[in-house]
Interface confidence: low
């Protein structure tokens, strides 16, 4: 992306989409009137620029150069129904959740298709994880390149992260880590996990000490997923940035090659945002480059990075991939996951601040049962008679969605889908099936977390050579 005003109509179009998302997220998040007004002003000005350049009004479903789809919605209606996704907000009006195929087109990524899944199976000699088989990880950038490297005995490494905003993590937060652990096991590669406590300090009303202590607490939950201590480095930005010149040098390089205008376009920053927020994307980008970790990779700059993350983190890494060749590094590859739906329905992602929107990793068996029974959005019918006659709707039923994430047995899941859709299984029975999966899952996690001593956390978070040799 050039270091100037949006160079093409398409960039302007994308900036409007992002700014529209920001406006909606500010409204949804009860932001101050000033913040909303300033964001709306910028949106209006971008739309005027677009109209001047394109000779027609901006329409959300009609990128420049594409014929407008036939629709009886006015532009405003269409725009309101568009899913929107950025690192802070996810919203959709559909009970089925985000339209991921549309998102792939909009983000310009590639679908994880059967062919790619088969290739992963061939390369690893392992059955693909159910997150791949079920389309939970659904999109990628350059995964074939990673497999090329792996098949040619060239190294790569994994990078994922967590924004530690509160001590309690929910089951949705485990998704990238469960999958990353599988990737680490089957490919036998190093892994770096970034705890963006600096980001949370900048965005939330927290002290630095609180942000750091959340990072350490969250690290215990991450470690409890079973990562190999000899192959995993977990780091807090607040901690590591000060002790790693390799990391900080890369942050500065990225900062030099990305303009304010670009981050404004990508992340929707406004003039009233603090400068810490504006420069933060460079910090999340830096771990994508191997020489940010000299203790692991020595001074090698050529080691490909693979980032498993939720699709809402893609804007950060689009920027990273854009800047990589300009500072002489390989572009990181990405694997994107779908969102983990809130208990109340797939329209939004779960929030750690709403206790009833989530199953927390600290919940007791009783709390899990109550939450699922009371709050899990149902695709069942209003009466037993209707349900028996017409069946339930698995596409919108949150208990079924959760089972697709956590019930590993494909046959059992398919049986449940058939029984629920046919009406043979009632909502209460579906919820019971989910409770029976979640209760031991959470109890086992809690038991493993109990085994994670402060000493172990310290070891995971100490910069050190991992059990790989990089010459």
């Amino acid at each position: 992306m050039p270091n100037s005003e949006p160079a093409s109509l398409l960039e302007l179009f994308n900036s409007i989409a992002t700014q529209g998302e920001l406006v909606r997220s500010l409204k949804a998040g009860n932001a101050s009137k000033d913040e909303i007004d300033s964001a709306v002003k910028m949106l209006v000005s971008l739309k005027m620029s677009y109209k001047a350049a394109a000779g027609e009004d901006y329409k959300a479903d009609c990128p420049p150069g594409n014929p407008a789809p036939t629709s009886n919605h006015g532009p405003d209606a269409t725009e309101a129904e568009e899913d929107f996704v950025d690192p802070w907000t996810v919203q959709t009006s559909s009970a089925k959740g985000i339209d991921y195929d549309k998102l792939i087109v909009r983000f310009g990524s590639s679908k994880i298709d059967k062919e790619l899944i088969n290739r992963i199976e061939r390369a690893t000699g392992q059955r693909p994880h159910h997150f791949l088989r079920r389309g939970i990880f659904f999109s990628h950038r350059d995964m074939n390149q990673v497999l090329d490297a792996y098949e040619n005995k060239k190294p790569f490494y994994l990078y994922t992260g967590r924004g530690p905003s509160s001590e309690a993590m929910h089951v949705g937060h485990l998704i990238p880590f469960i999958f990353t652990k599988w990737l680490q096991d089957v490919f036998n590669v190093p892994l770096v996990i970034q705890m963006t406590d600096d980001e949370k300090y900048l965005w939330k009303d927290l002290t630095l000490d609180q942000a750091y202590s959340y990072a350490v607490e969250n690290a215990k939950d991450i470690i409890a997923c079973g990562f190999d201590i000899n192959k995993t480095f977990i780091f807090s930005d607040l901690d590591y940035m000060g002790m790693s010149s390799g990391f900080y040098k890369n942050v500065v390089k990225i900062q030099k090659h990305v303009t304010f205008n670009q981050v404004k376009g990508i992340f929707g920053f406004t003039d009233s945002d603090c400068i810490g927020k504006i420069s933060f994307p460079a910090i999340q980008a830096a771990p994508s480059f191997s020489n940010s970790f000299p203790q692991i990779f020595r001074d090698r700059t050529d080691i490909q990075c693979l980032i498993p993350c939720a699709i809402d983190q893609d804007p950060y890494f689009r920027m990273t991939r854009d800047v990589a060749p300009r500072i002489g590094y390989p572009k990181p590859a990405l694997l994107h996951s779908t969102f983990f739906p809130a208990l109340q329905g797939a329209q939004t992602k779960m929030s750690a601040s709403d206790p009833n929107s989530s199953i927390f990793l600290t919940d007791t068996a009783k709390q899990i049962k109550t939450k699922v029974n009371k709050h899990a959005f149902s695709g069942g019918r209003d009466t037993i008679e209707e349900h028996r006659q017409f069946g339930g709707n698995c596409d919108v039923d949150v208990s079924f969605m959760y089972l697709t994430f956590f019930l590993e047995d494909d046959d059992k899941l398919e049986q449940i889908r058939k029984d629920y859709t046919s009406g043979a299984m009632l909502t209460g029975e579906l919820k019971k099936a989910l409770i029976e999966v979640l209760q031991p899952l959470i109890a086992e996690h809690q038991a493993r977390r109990k085994e994670v001593t402060d000493e172990i956390v310290k070891e995971f978070m100490t910069p050190r050579k991992l059990s790989f040799d990089f010459q």
Epitope: D228, N230, E408, E444, R448, K450, E451, V452, I456
Partner: antibody, heavy 121, light 107 residues
Framework: QAYLQQSGAELVRPGASVKMSCKAS????????MHWVKQTPRQGLEWIGA????????SYNQKFKGKATLTVGKSSSTAYMQLSSLTSEDSAVYFC??????????????WGQGTSVTVSS | DIQMTQTTSSLSASLGDRVTISCRAS??????LNWFQQKPDGTVKLLIY???RLHSGVPSRFSGSGSGTDYSLTISNLEQEDFATYFC?????????FGGGTKLEIK
């Protein structure tokens, strides 16, 4: 190299209590959980419970709650298990085992030599 | 509780033989399966952790495999010191549970 030295064999009367020890050396005692396991010819190996010497936190197999009490002496790097209200069912060999986390993915990597307890009148 | 079953309680083999000992869990244990060796004098050693990873100091003739509910331990070239009892143990969920053991005897 981690090494666990357990106390000697015990012959005790029914209804009495017994307290056995497991002295650790060769590693940082407070950094690793200590697990206890019972072995009998009839039931084989059974997990009793574990204690984290760093803060005294413990967890028990439901079956042994009220029967076994786990404690530690940090200064002497020693873990203890007390068994109360003994019956012939408690006659067994009891092992302590260090629980190593991380590269061994939750495994009891070093075991004591076992303490034999015989309950007899 | 998860039940661990070692169907073969004893097994006879000769020096140099290759033997496989199996273990079945009552539910999926996601590879959290460890193998232990107990010598006649009662000493217990960890051989293999997490299904297939060799504990430090364990000879490479020992190997493990499996997934889901079915796991096995293979000793490829039996030596005198390998005649002992072998136990499997699941570490996926509390309480940890063990198989009944397989005693490997000289033919």
């Amino acid at each position: 190299q981690a090494y666990l030295q357990q106390s000697g064999a015990e012959l005790v009367r029914p209804g009495a209590s017994v307290k056995m020890s497991c002295k650790a050396s060769g590693y940082t005692f407070t950094s690793y959980n200590m697990h206890w396991v019972k072995q009998t010819p009839r039931q084989g190996l059974e997990w009793i419970g574990a204690i984290y010497p760093g803060n005294g936190d413990s967890s028990y197999n439901q079956k042994f709650k009220g029967k076994a009490t786990l404690t530690v002496g940090k200064s002497s790097s020693t873990a203890y298990m007390q068994l109360s209200s003994l019956t012939s069912e408690d006659s067994a060999v009891y092992f302590c085992a260090r629980w190593h986390y991380g590269s061994t993915y939750y495994a009891m990597d070093y075991w004591g030599q076992g303490t034999s307890v015989t309950v007899s009148s | 509780d998860i039940q661990m079953t070692q169907t073969t309680s004893s097994l006879s083999a000769s020096l140099g033989d290759r033997v496989t000992i199996s273990c079945r869990a009552s539910q999926d244990i996601s590879n959290y399966l460890n193998w232990f060796q107990q010598k006649p004098d009662g000493t217990v050693k960890l051989l293999i952790y997490y299904t297939s990873r060799l504990h430090s100091g364990v000879p490479s003739r020992f190997s493990g495999s499996g997934s889901g509910t079915d796991y096995s331990l293979t000793i490829s070239n039996l030596e005198q010191e390998d005649f002992a009892t072998y136990f499997c143990q699941q570490g996926k969920t509390l309480p940890h549970t063990f198989g009944g053991g397989t005693k490997l005897e000289i033919k």
